[in-house]
Each structure stands twice: as structure tokens, then as C-alpha cells.
């Protein structure tokens, strides 16, 4: 009776369990009743990082110097290239696909510490009573306007992204 499931590092094809190709190799032809799975090593600048049945290897990542990237770790037939940023620059994401001089803090966050040559911008959430309505790499959270000191009342409450809106006091006639 043909198998319905295969062991680890095998795959089911034509009612038969074939061996997967090892990392660093791609599938050329499936196994048959009489032959083993045929695999071939990935070419230069290619890789496959899992046991697989892929017919094409993946291209190594290109660390584009025009984006400020350089190679941190050269790829192998089993691993992708790892990029990092030029000295003094910072990756925009975990995958490090591009670089920025320093990151900015989004609305609702203020700059706790301005970036230096060695450390990126440190952002902090604006606490109650403070706001930031801009993306910035230097601006702190600003305190809400004090309506009372202007002899006005709060017409609209502030948030971490917006200032309070002040308005005239209702005068009793």
C-alpha cells in the first residue's frame, strides 16, 4: 500500500517517499522506484538554507553601497549574506535593507536622547500632559498648553499627539 506520510527529511511524490535535498543543494529530479532523489549544489552567490525540494536556489542578498550597506557576513551555499550599515549609520529594519543616519521619533513620541556617532536616537512615549505631533530626531515631547494661565478653559482634551484646545469661559449672564 502506498504511503500517505513520509519521515522527516522526506517528501511524498507519486505515492512514493523521496529524500529532500540537503541545505545548499537544489532538486534536479525526484526519486523513482529505482533511483534516489537527484540534487545539485547551489551556484556561486546562491543558497538554500533548509532541507528542500526547490528547483532553484535563492540569490544572496546584495548589500548595496548606494544605500549605505556593506557585507557583515558573506553568504554560503547554506546561508544568505548578512548586510549591515556603514559606520555611524543605522539599519531601518531587522533585515537591514537600507540605512539612515539616525531614526526619528514618530508623533506621540519625543526624543529622549539625540543620536551620536555610536548610538541611534532614543525615543520615549509622551506622558500624560505632553504631546508630539511631528516626526523628529531632536524634538522632545511638548507640554500641553495651560488654558488656565490664559484665563481660558479646555475645550478639547489633549492627547499624546495633540495639544489641548483652549476656548473662552462661558460667562453667566
Amino acid at each position: 500500500e502506498p504511503p500517505t506520510a513520509c519521515r522527516e527529511k522526506q517528501y511524498l511524490i507519486n505515492s512514493q517517499c523521496c529524500s529532500l535535498c540537503q541545505p545548499g543543494q537544489k532538486l534536479v529530479s525526484d526519486c523513482t522506484e529505482f533511483t534516489e532523489t537527484e540534487c545539485l549544489p547551489c551556484g556561486e552567490s546562491e543558497f538554500l538554507d533548509t532541507w528542500n525540494r526547490e528547483t532553484h536556489c535563492h540569490q544572496h542578498k546584495y548589500c548595496d553601497p548606494n544605500l549605505g550597506l556593506r557585507v557583515q557576513q558573506k553568504g554560503t551555499s547554506e546561508t544568505d549574506t548578512i548586510c549591515t550599515c556603514e559606520e555611524g549609520w543605522h539599519c531601518t529594519s531587522e533585515a537591514c535593507e537600507s540605512c539612515v543616519l539616525h531614526r526619528s521619533c514618530s508623533p506621540g513620541f519625543g526624543v529622549k536622547q539625540i543620536a551620536t556617532g555610536v548610538s541611534d536616537t532614543i525615543c520615549e512615549p509622551c506622558p500624560v500632559g505632553f504631546f508630539s505631533n511631528v516626526s523628529s530626531a531632536f524634538e522632545k515631547c511638548h507640554p500641553w498648553t495651560s488654558c488656565e494661565t490664559k484665563d481660558l478653559v479646555v475645550q478639547q482634551a489633549g492627547t499624546n499627539k495633540t495639544d489641548v484646545v483652549c476656548g473662552p469661559q462661558d460667562r453667566l449672564r
Epitope: 549605505g68 543616519l101 524634538e139
Partner: nanobody, 116 residues
Framework: EVQLLESGGGLVQPGGSLRLSCAAS???????EMWWVRQAPGKGLERVS?????????YYADSVKGRFTISRDNSKNTLYLQMNSLRAEDTAVYYC?????????WGQGTLVTVSS
């Protein structure tokens, strides 16, 4: 395409002054926080000064505070850096850059040399 063109650098004696300009195009200048950054020979990038889009708030590195003034003219799409009381340690290539400060958003820079 973002273009930032710095000018105004040159050779100046210690104690002298220079005014750098940065002409911006390819983006809506008035919407962006702008920075001046410098790189001294053989050193890393140093953040010098920044200005918010409206030109109402500024930042200065401690090393230039009280000597440098950043400003902008949104009608001319131009950023400025007035540098007074220049010192030998201000010698560097000065670049202007815009938020979000990607590697592509840079000009060629302008060289400032302070020497007697």
C-alpha cells in the same frame, strides 16, 4: 529625485565667519526637518544642528552652541548655517540632510577649512 546642494565653504582663519547654504529640490522642503552634519578628516559623522519645518525650533551640538546659527527660508527652499568664531576643530565637510536621513538624501557637501 531629492537633491541637496551645499555651498559657501572655503578657507577661513580662526575666529572668522562663514555662511553655508543648502539648496533643496525634489521634495516639499517646508514639510521637512533639516539637519547640518559634518565629517572631519578621518573622523565619523557629527550631528551639528537641526531645525524644524517651520523654523521655530532648533538644536545645536554642544561643540557649536553659541557660535553657529541654523535658519531656513521656505520660500527659497534653502537651509543656512551661519558659523562664527570658527576654530581649527570645525574643519570638516559639511552636509545638509533631511528626515528620514536615508543614505540617498545627501548632497556632495562643502569643505570648511579653518587654518591660519
Amino acid at each position: 529625485e531629492v537633491q541637496l546642494l551645499e555651498s559657501g565653504g572655503g578657507l577661513v582663519q580662526p575666529g572668522g565667519s562663514l555662511r553655508l547654504s543648502c539648496a533643496a529640490s525634489g521634495f516639499t522642503f517646508r514639510d521637512y526637518e533639516m539637519w547640518w552634519v559634518r565629517q572631519a578628516p578621518g573622523k565619523g559623522l557629527e550631528r551639528v544642528s537641526a531645525i524644524n519645518p517651520q523654523g521655530t525650533r532648533t538644536y545645536y551640538a554642544d561643540s557649536v552652541k553659541g557660535r553657529f546659527t541654523i535658519s531656513r527660508d521656505n520660500s527659497k527652499n534653502t537651509l543656512y548655517l551661519q558659523m562664527n568664531s570658527l576654530r581649527a576643530e570645525d574643519t570638516a565637510v559639511y552636509y545638509c540632510t533631511k528626515l528620514p536621513f536615508t543614505f540617498e538624501d545627501w548632497g556632495q557637501g562643502t569643505l570648511v577649512t579653518v587654518s591660519s
